[in-house]
C-alpha cells in the first residue's frame, strides 16, 4: 500500500512540477523592471525567454518576439535549451510513469517491468527538475550580473545636468515558478525512485517447484496456505478482483520468498 501511495504521489507531484516548468517557460515575466529608482513609472518593462513586453499605464501592453536566433545572448539560448530539455524529459517521464503505475493494469505486465519503468521515469523527472532549476538559476545569475553592471553605469558617466537612468531588471515571477516547479519535479522523481525499490521483486536462491498430479492439470504450490506478504497477495478463500486474479488454489506458481521445497 505504501509503495502504491509513494508512486502515485510521486506521479502527481511530478505532474504539477512539469506543468509549472511549462508555465514558467511560456511566461513573459522572467525579468521585470526594477522600480527602485522610479517607483512611479508610467511605462513598465518585462522580458521572457521568447519576447519582451512593455506595459503602459494607459493599460496597453505591447510585446515583441525575439525574431532572431543568432543575435540573442548565448546564455539566453542555453536557458531556453535547458527548459525545453526539462519539458521533453518530463513529458516522456510522465508517459512512462503512467504505464508504470501500480493501480493501472496493462495486460500481464510483471512487477519487475513496472519497477524498471518507475525507476526510468523517476530518473527522467530528476533530470527534468535539475534542468529547470539550472535554467532558472543561470538566468537569475545573468540578471544579478547585469543588475550590478547597470547600477555601476548609472552612477558613473552621468552628465550632472541630465539624468539618463538605465533600465535595470530584477527577478520576475517566472523565476520563482521555475524554481518551485523544478523542485517539485525533482521531489516527484525521488519519490518514484523510492517506490521502484518497493515494487521490485527481491531475488532469492530458491525457485518454486510445481508438482503435477497425474490426470489433473492443477499446480500445487508448497506453502500455499501460508499468509504471504507484499502487495497484491491473496488471502485464503477470498476472491479478489485484480484484473484477472484467481483464488489461491488456482494461482500458478511464481518464484516467491515464501516458496520452499
Amino acid at each position: 500500500m505504501a509503495v502504491t501511495a509513494c508512486q502515485g504521489l510521486g506521479f502527481v507531484v511530478s505532474l504539477i512540477g512539469i506543468a509549472g516548468i511549462i508555465a514558467a517557460t511560456c511566461m513573459d515575466q522572467w525579468s521585470t523592471q526594477d522600480l527602485y529608482n522610479n517607483p512611479v513609472t508610467a511605462v513598465f518593462n518585462y522580458q521572457g525567454l521568447w519576447r519582451s513586453c512593455v506595459r503602459e499605464s494607459s493599460g496597453f501592453t505591447e510585446c515583441r518576439g525575439y525574431f532572431t536566433l543568432l543575435g540573442l545572448p548565448a546564455m539566453l539560448q542555453a536557458v531556453r535549451a535547458l527548459m525545453i530539455v526539462g519539458i521533453v524529459l518530463g513529458a516522456i517521464g510522465l508517459l512512462v510513469s503512467i504505464f508504470a503505475l501500480k493501480c493501472i493494469r496493462i495486460g500481464s505486465m510483471e512487477d519487475s517491468a513496472k519497477a524498471n519503468m518507475t525507476l526510468t521515469s523517476g530518473i527522467m523527472f530528476i533530470v527534468s527538475g535539475l534542468c529547470a532549476i539550472a535554467g532558472v538559476s543561470v538566468f537569475a545569475n545573468m540578471l544579478v550580473t547585469n543588475f550590478w553592471m547597470s547600477t555601476a553605469n548609472m552612477y558613473t558617466g552621468m552628465g550632472g545636468m541630465v539624468q539618463t537612468v538605465q533600465t535595470r531588471y530584477t527577478f520576475g515571477a517566472a523565476l520563482f515558478v521555475g524554481w518551485v516547479a523544478g523542485g517539485l519535479t525533482l521531489i516527484g522523481g525521488v519519490m518514484m525512485c523510492i517506490a521502484c525499490r518497493g515494487l521490485a521483486p527481491e531475488e532469492t536462491n530458491y525457485k518454486a517447484v510445481s508438482y503435477h498430479a497425474s490426470g489433473h492439470s492443477v499446480a500445487y504450490k508448497p506453502g500455499g496456505f501460508k499468509a504471504s506478504t507484499g502487495f497484491g497477495s491473496n488471502t485464503k478463500n477470498k476472491k479478489i478482483y485484480d484484473g484477472g486474479a484467481r483464488t489461491e488454489d488456482e494461482v500458478q506458481s511464481y518464484p516467491s520468498k515464501h516458496d520452499y521445497v
Epitope: Q33, N38, V40, T41, A42, V43, N45, Y46, Q47, S52, C53, V54, E56, S57, S58, G59, F60, E62, R64, V162, Q163, T164, V165, Q166, T167
Partner: antibody, heavy 118, light 113 residues
Framework: QVHLQQSGAELVRPGSSVKISCKAS????????MNWVRQRPGQGLEWIGQ????????KYSGKFNSKDTLTADKSSNTAYMQLNSLTSEDSAVYFC???????????WGQGTSVTVSS | DIVLTQSPSSLTVTAGEKVTMSCKSS????????????LTWYQQKSGQPPKLLIY???TRESGVPDRFTGSGSGTDFTLTISSVQAEDLAVYYC?????????FGVGTKLELK
C-alpha cells in the same frame, strides 16, 4: 465616435466645493483611464490626476492630492472631479481627457470654467 | 518630477515659413524596453481644448497634416512645421508620458507677423 461632454461653467464662493462632470460616449468607458487637467487663465496645462473607472483606482499629482477627489460612475459613463476648499487660485478651466495607447491624451472635453469669487 | 523646458516661449512667423520649437527634459524619456520616447506634442488654439499632434516623439496622429514633424530622442526633442499656415497659430505643448506625475512644458506660442 469618441466624445467627452463636460458640465457647464461654475461661479462659486471661496471655501466652498464644486463637482464637475465629464460624460463619455463612443467607447468602453470602464477600460480607459480618465485624466483631469487644469489650465489657469493665460497659463499652461497642469495634470491633476487620473481615474480608472473599471475599478476606481486613482493617481494624483502631488500638489492636488489632498484637495481634489476623482470619482467615476460606470452606469452613467461619467467621471467626476470634486474641488474642495476653493480659493481664487483654483479659478481655471478644467479639462477631462481620455488616456490612450502611448500614454497620450487623445480625446479632450471642451473644458469647464470654474471661477472662485466672493 | 520630470521638468520639460520649452523654447522659445513665443515665435512670430510669416506664412509659408519653416518653424522649429524645442522641448528639453530633465530626465530621459526613452524607454529601453521598446526603444520609444514617451514625449507627446499637443496643439491648443485659443478657446479650445488641446489637440493631440504627435506621440512617441515622432509618430504623427491620424488626421494631422504631414507638415508637422516630431524628432529627437532621450532628453532633446523638436517639433517642426515645414510650412506654417494661418490655421497653425496656436500654443504648442510637449508632455511627458514616461513617469508620474505626467508633466507639460510651459508651451510655445506661435504668432503671425
Amino acid at each position: 465616435q469618441v466624445h467627452l461632454q463636460q458640465s457647464g461653467a461654475e461661479l462659486v464662493r471661496p471655501g466652498s466645493s464644486v463637482k464637475i462632470s465629464c460624460k463619455a460616449s463612443g467607447y468602453a468607458f470602464s477600460n480607459y483611464w480618465m485624466n483631469w487637467v487644469r489650465q489657469r487663465p493665460g497659463q499652461g496645462l497642469e495634470w491633476i490626476g487620473q481615474i480608472y473607472p473599471g475599478n476606481g483606482d486613482t493617481k494624483y499629482s502631488g500638489k492636488f492630492n489632498s484637495k481634489d477627489t476623482l470619482t467615476a460612475d460606470k452606469s452613467s459613463n461619467t467621471a467626476y472631479m470634486q474641488l474642495n476648499s476653493l480659493t481664487s487660485e483654483d479659478s481655471a478651466v478644467y479639462f477631462c481627457a481620455r488616456f490612450y495607447y502611448g500614454n497620450v491624451m487623445d480625446y479632450w472635453g471642451q473644458g469647464t470654467s470654474v471661477t472662485v469669487s466672493s | 518630477d520630470i521638468v520639460l523646458t520649452q523654447s522659445p516661449s513665443s515665435l512670430t512667423v510669416t506664412a509659408g515659413e519653416k518653424v522649429t520649437m524645442s522641448c528639453k527634459s530633465s530626465q530621459t524619456l526613452l524607454n529601453g524596453g521598446n526603444q520609444k520616447n514617451y514625449l507627446t506634442w499637443y496643439q491648443q488654439k485659443s478657446g479650445q481644448p488641446p489637440k493631440l499632434l504627435i506621440y512617441w516623439a515622432s509618430t504623427r496622429e491620424s488626421g494631422v497634416p504631414d507638415r508637422f514633424t516630431g524628432s529627437g530622442s532621450g532628453t532633446d526633442f523638436t517639433l517642426t512645421i515645414s510650412s506654417v499656415q494661418a490655421e497653425d497659430l496656436a500654443v504648442y505643448y510637449c508632455q511627458n508620458g514616461y513617469s508620474y506625475p505626467l508633466t507639460f512644458g510651459v508651451g510655445t506660442k506661435l504668432e503671425l507677423k
